[in-house]
Interface confidence: low
Amino acid sequence: KNNVPRLKLSYKEMLESNNVITFNGLANSSSYHTFLLDEERSRLYVGAKDHIFSFDLVNIKDFQKIVWPVSYTRRDECKWAGKDILKECANFIKVLKAYNQTHLYACGTGAFHPICTYIEIGHHPEDNIFKLENSHFENGRGKSPYDPKLLTASLLIDGELYSGTAADFMGRDFAIFRTLGHHHPIRTEQHDSRWLNDPKFISAHLISESDNPEDDKVYFFFRENAIDGEHSGKATHARIGQICKNDFGGHRSLVNKWTTFLKARLICSVPGPNGIDTHFDELQDVFLMNFKDPKNPVVYGVFTTSSNIFKGSAVCMYSMSDVRRVFLGPYAHRDGPNYQWVPYQGRVPYPRPGTCPSKTFGGFDSTKDLPDDVITFARSHPAMYNPVFPMNNRPIVIKTDVNYQFTQIVVDRVDAEDGQYDVMFIGTDVGTVLKVVSIPKETWYDLEEVLLEEMTVFREPTAISAMELSTKQQQLYIGSTAGVAQLPLHRCDIYGKACAECCLARDPYCAWDGSACSRYFPTAKRRTRRQDIRNGDPLTHCSD
């Protein structure tokens, strides 16, 4: 019953009801994939092919643009290397991050010659500055991939750029890097499939471990090929990887390599017939819901199946306490290639590999001071044996009977009359957005999903590749190869002209105000607002 959306709006209906604003791209650009939301300045920065845009959050029709192509020489070199002049021999922007109060940091593929630079945006929004620092270009190797088809995950904090990307022309040397800043660049171990095995990077996030910033960790989400012995046949595993922010590599071994890198498998599956689980292993996107405690965000992951025969998508939720428990559990160990993976049962050296050097957890001030046995162990045991299971051990959203797959997710926490609800906006590979609310049943972690809306946001079916949500503007911004779309988070008036219809919608954004279905705001005048998200019961709430 919950698989049928309360509202299903075509692109035409979205336009006619003024519920979508689209930027249909420039003739000489495409690939509007790299988003950076700046709520303070009320701008959405978008990296695309040969361009960087600055859209007004109020209305994306109002925008500024920077043209940043490659030189003719560079383009010709790319063409001579056998690459496609339109699809590959251009500057596809892959990294777009806030560098400081006045500048952004941007990197592009540079026609298979990665390049980075700084973009001046001024001190204040009213400065209206948006320009390329032409005098300051940097080598983009280890920051942006060479190949525009490859995914990159990046995070810029304290002047240091963390990137998960491919560092070579061939797109084989995948690594997690830390560049910029005053320290020597650091990366994952090279040519060791136990560390990374043909990964596809999704996103990177800084999460505090304690009140001591020395314990801060950077988490990377990615999917990769399962190593032989983990699975029979070719398989993909979804992963979460951790790195200590204060990791400066080893002294004698793992010099300028991470010493605290660990990874664990993310499971998102449903029990199937014959006791065989159906796994959603292809991680597509991740959203971190920070609420109250920044140390413990809820992780929302969008997954699809690997199978070509059975197409399905799911959303799974993970708690950081479960993630940390896995990283404190047994390491994965095997006695050689093609051997079975087992939980490591030998002596684990002290301090435990993966622990950040800090005063919180004991004696070592720097990773360079770590004993040799810790480094050696870390080098050879990057994976944890136990996987991270989702909250409630199952997905909160599953779609298997449709002709599309999920690609992106953003989540908004909404105050309603009867509590707080997480509303998910899920992008698909056919250019639609699903609006789903998860409603607690008996316990808060036992959730019911209600599909509120299914909206087509692009004229032609095109995969949604980027999404950002502005709580300030109450708007959703969507990117694809074709362009950028903007839509409000709620369309309460469309639910109908009666209290019962509004109540049955179970949309946390909306309530019956006595005369119309409109945006719900928690106010003192509670009795005048009719809303029931948990049960959607109009009899109780609309009878008078």
């Epitope: 060791d192 136990r194 032989d228 095997r334 050689g336 093609n338 079975q340 002596r347 050879s380």
Partner: antibody, heavy 120, light 111 residues
Framework: EVQLLESGGGLVQPGGSLRLSCAAS????????MSWVRQAPGKGLEWVSA???????YYADSVKGRFTISRDNSKNTLYLQMNSLRAEDTAVYYC??????????????WGQGTLVTVSS | QSVLTQPPSASGTPGQRVTISCSGS????????VNWYQQLPGTAPKLLIY???LRPSGVPDRFSGSKSGTSASLAISGLQSEDEADYYC????????????FGGGTKLTVL
């Protein structure tokens, strides 16, 4: 102190059988993968067989179907049962422990070896 | 014929630096770590270098390992007479199920 002591070698006729043993001491035997490596007279090292901590077994093509590796964790002993022996199996047979930190193939301790001679 | 290729012999005078090469393929050295063993005359092999470039405790820092692509090398600096031995490189081979492959060995002579 880690010690590996092989025994059971000797002279055997082609087609015959022999069982090698390797007594381990000074470490938790059950936590380590073990291997047999051989060295023909005047020749280089050749990996023969391995057994993982979980009991999974691996063999070189040259001995597959003829040799059987096993372990008895209660006795801290590794075995190699060699059947249908050939002249080319003549070698010094070493038992070796795989280093538990590297998760790879570094044999950090070796026995002194036992000589197997296959001749009529 | 060994899967990993080493020169059959090498030599040097005391104090000299000697390098022994080990060449493989993408399925062994190219995708797995390399180990080196020293076998003194009449004794069992001894682990000299593991994980491409790490020395077990007790191995002098005159011995160093390195790897690039599908080749590895062992360098011995400040050669001493007691270094006269056979040296073997080894690696897993992913194309063989669970195999460790060894080089043919290099006989090092200290002149």
């Amino acid at each position: 102190e880690v010690q590996l002591l092989e025994s059971g070698g000797g002279l055997v006729q082609p087609g015959g059988s022999l069982r090698l043993s390797c007594a381990a001491s000074g470490f938790t035997f059950s936590s380590y993968a073990m291997s047999w490596v051989r060295q023909a007279p005047g020749k280089g090292l050749e990996w023969v067989s391995a057994i993982g901590t979980g009991g999974d077994t691996y063999y070189a093509d040259s001995v597959k179907g003829r040799f059987t590796i096993s372990r008895d964790n209660s006795k801290n002993t590794l075995y190699l049962q060699m059947n249908s022996l050939r002249a080319e199996d003549t070698a010094v047979y070493y038992c070796a422990r795989r280093d538990d930190y590297t998760s790879r193939d570094a044999f950090d301790y070796w026995g002194q070896g036992t000589l197997v001679t296959v001749s009529s | 014929q060994s899967v990993l290729t080493q020169p059959p012999s090498a030599s040097g005078t005391p104090g000299q630096r000697v390098t022994i090469s080990c060449s493989g393929s993408s399925s062994n050295i190219g995708s797995n770590t390399v180990n080196w063993y020293q076998q003194l005359p009449g004794t069992a092999p001894k682990l000299l270098i593991y994980y491409d470039d790490l020395r077990p405790s007790g191995v002098p820092d005159r011995f160093s390992g390195s790897k690039s692509g599908t080749s590895a090398s062992l360098a011995i600096s400040g050669l001493q007479s007691e270094d006269e031995a056979d040296y073997y490189c080894a690696a897993w081979d992913d194309s063989l199920n669970g195999y460790v492959v060894f080089g043919g060995g290099t006989k090092l002579t200290v002149l």
